[in-house]
Interface confidence: medium
Amino acid sequence: IPVIEPSGPELVVKPGETVTLRCVGNGSVEWDGPISPHWTLYSDGPSSVLTTNNATFQNTRTYRCTEPGDPLGGSAAIHLYVKDPARPWNVLAKEVVVFEDQDALLPCLLTDPVLEAGVSLVRLRGRPLLRHTNYSFSPWHGFIIHRAKFIQGQDYQCSALMGGRKVMSISIRLKVQKVIPGPPALTLVPAELVRIRGEAAQIVCSASNIDVDFDVFLQHNTTKLAIPQRSDFHDNRYQKVLTLSLGQVDFQHAGNYSCVASNVQGKHSTSMFFRVVESAYLDLSSEQNLIQEVTVGEGLNLKVMVEAYPGLQGFNWTYLGPFSDHQPEPKLANATTKDTYRHTFTLSLPRLKPSEAGRYSFLARNPGGWRALTFELTLRYPPEVSVIWTSINGSGTLLCAASGYPQPNVTWLQCAGHTDRCDEAQVLQVWVDPHPEVLSQEPFQKVTVQSLLTAETLEHNQTYECRAHNSVGSGSWAFIPISAGARTHPPDEFLFTP
């Protein structure tokens, strides 16, 4: 570590005296600059010497010497006071810039340590400090305003009592800059714009920032627009607003508009698209299939997406039949606006009843005309089964009728014993009817099919079961013969062994 002679840490001299400061180290040493022109600097082997033949109050400051080759980076310092009876202060800088909440050092150095007891900080021309100004003083460094606030950006003077009289330093201007958290906040209104050729349009680009030092511009595609700027200040933020007003739009006005704002922290931009059309439009679409199938008792939401300009003048859901003349309840119809020109309309159909199957149409109107989108709703039902014993062409026949949607398929089972339902262990024979006869198949209604099992003799201690199933469920009907003597003759193509 280098050593300074005289040993210090402080040296007090009078103006006009000669001052010599010698720094000695193991290797080469140097004085931390900048050294004022009043000093002469020369090297003498491993030492460096600063000397002045005519010390002035402006030589008052801390002189530090370092040894560049020292791996520990040690340094030595001495503080020189040149106590001028007329000059209590040496001001090292007339402007100090800090960010809010940083400590601000006002570098007025006292030229005579004896005066320390009578120092104070005032604003220019002896005005008192603002309330809540928290400061401290160091004779080596000056006044420190702790955690400086924006409002404390003022002109200050350092004051010292000399012979009962306050003597001021020259003024120091403190600038306290607001901490800019990021690029300016932006809004571009509207987020999307559609106009018919010849209509008027307005696009507003506004930016706000914590201080006034920021720029904002509006760009159309790649062209920067020259628009007058309106400025304002509210909510502790500076606002800059650019308004593009177009009296009669044409196709060349269409395209991408970007609002761009920048400050010291960077740039922020947001964009919108302006579409110019020849005439009004109204488009209806759905992400759903227009043909819907739902199990009876369940619910369904029918959704229609609408894209329109100008806005809708009317819309409604209509039930087109074929069953009752009921209409959807308004409370079940819901409209949501995704943005200015796109809307979603939903019809909620909870716990669907048989009479609610059929066609549902969404109709909408704007100056471009009427449009409609129709859904076809078919209800699914699990099969309902019934078996009767009848004679057809003199032959005894089991007749199974199954009704449901989708169309049920039919299986016959013969099993041992009397039972309500055949289980696997009891099954003696199974017949699958590949083509049951369709008795009725009307739109939006159940499909009814019929399957025949011709019986010559029915075994007395056996059960004959007709089973029907579809994607919704299954149903069955067991038939137990009352008298013996008949035998069954299923068609050949029906027969298989389980």
Epitope: Q58, R87, N90, V91, K94, E95, L124, R125, G126, L130, F150, I151, G153, Q154, D155, Q157, M168, I170, S171, R173, K175, V176, D211, V212, D213
Partner: antibody
């Protein structure tokens, strides 16, 4: 080029108030103090007060303390001087001036407004 | 409070002549090697115009015939050769400490 444009001449009754505006263009408004100076007919220049537009803090000459209010709107780059309880001796040309960028020497006025004549008469 | 006294109150000269205007401060306006004094020119019906700051530095665009000198309490504005447009009132101003004060002015008129 920096320009300071002041509001037009005013005729006021004694006891009333006057508010003079000074709009700056062509420079960074917040960087320099705005200083108000007045000049009575045939008289010299008299400092009234000043404002730091950067944070809105104003200083007033002792003579005008309590009667003058200096404000600045950084968003429109405009400074205002309002003088209340007017009397006939307040008849003067009121100037706004901008402090120059001479950091070694604060309160040197390098740009001036054209002046606003305020006449106080009953 | 520092008072600035200008003399003479009126100076009658012809174009081409040298004008010497004085400004005296009631106490020193120099500090740390700087002189806190400025000079302004004012023509009838116009706003003042900055000529000199720091006692001797010419402001932007000011012709070389205008020069300032002095330190401490005594300051001088010199116009080496008067042009017709130089006939006006000249004010000195204390530009840093205490009050922002002006001298009473010196009128330079055509003889």
């Amino acid at each position: 080029q920096v320009q300071l444009v002041q509001s037009g001449a005013e005729v006021k009754k004694p006891g009333s108030s006057v508010k003079v505006s000074c709009k700056a263009s062509g420079g960074t408004f917040s960087s320099y103090y705005i200083i108000w100076v007045r000049q009575a007919p045939g008289q010299g220049l008299e400092w009234m007060g000043d404002i730091n537009p950067y944070n809105g803090t104003a200083n007033y000459a002792q003579k005008f303390q309590g009667r003058v209010t200096i404000t600045a709107d950084e968003s429109t780059s405009t400074a205002y001087m309002e003088l209340s309880s007017l009397r006939s001796e307040d008849t003067a040309v009121y100037y706004c001036a901008r402090e120059g960028p001479y950091f070694s020497n604060l309160y040197v006025m390098d740009y001036w407004g054209q002046g606003t004549l305020v006449t106080v008469s009953s | 409070e520092i008072v600035l006294t200008q003399s003479p109150a009126t100076l009658s000269l012809s174009p081409g002549e040298r004008a010497t205007l004085s400004c005296r401060a009631s106490q020193s306006v120099s500090y740390q090697g700087e002189n806190y004094l400025a000079w302004y020119q004012q023509k009838p019906g116009q706003a003042p115009r900055l000529l000199i700051y720091d006692a001797s530095n010419r402001a932007t665009g000011i012709p070389a015939r205008f020069s300032g000198s002095g330190s401490g309490t005594d300051f001088t504005l010199t116009i080496s050769s008067l042009e017709p447009e130089d006939f006006a009132v000249y004010y000195c101003q204390l530009s840093n400490q205490d009050l922002l004060t002006f001298g009473g002015g010196t009128k330079v008129e055509i003889k």
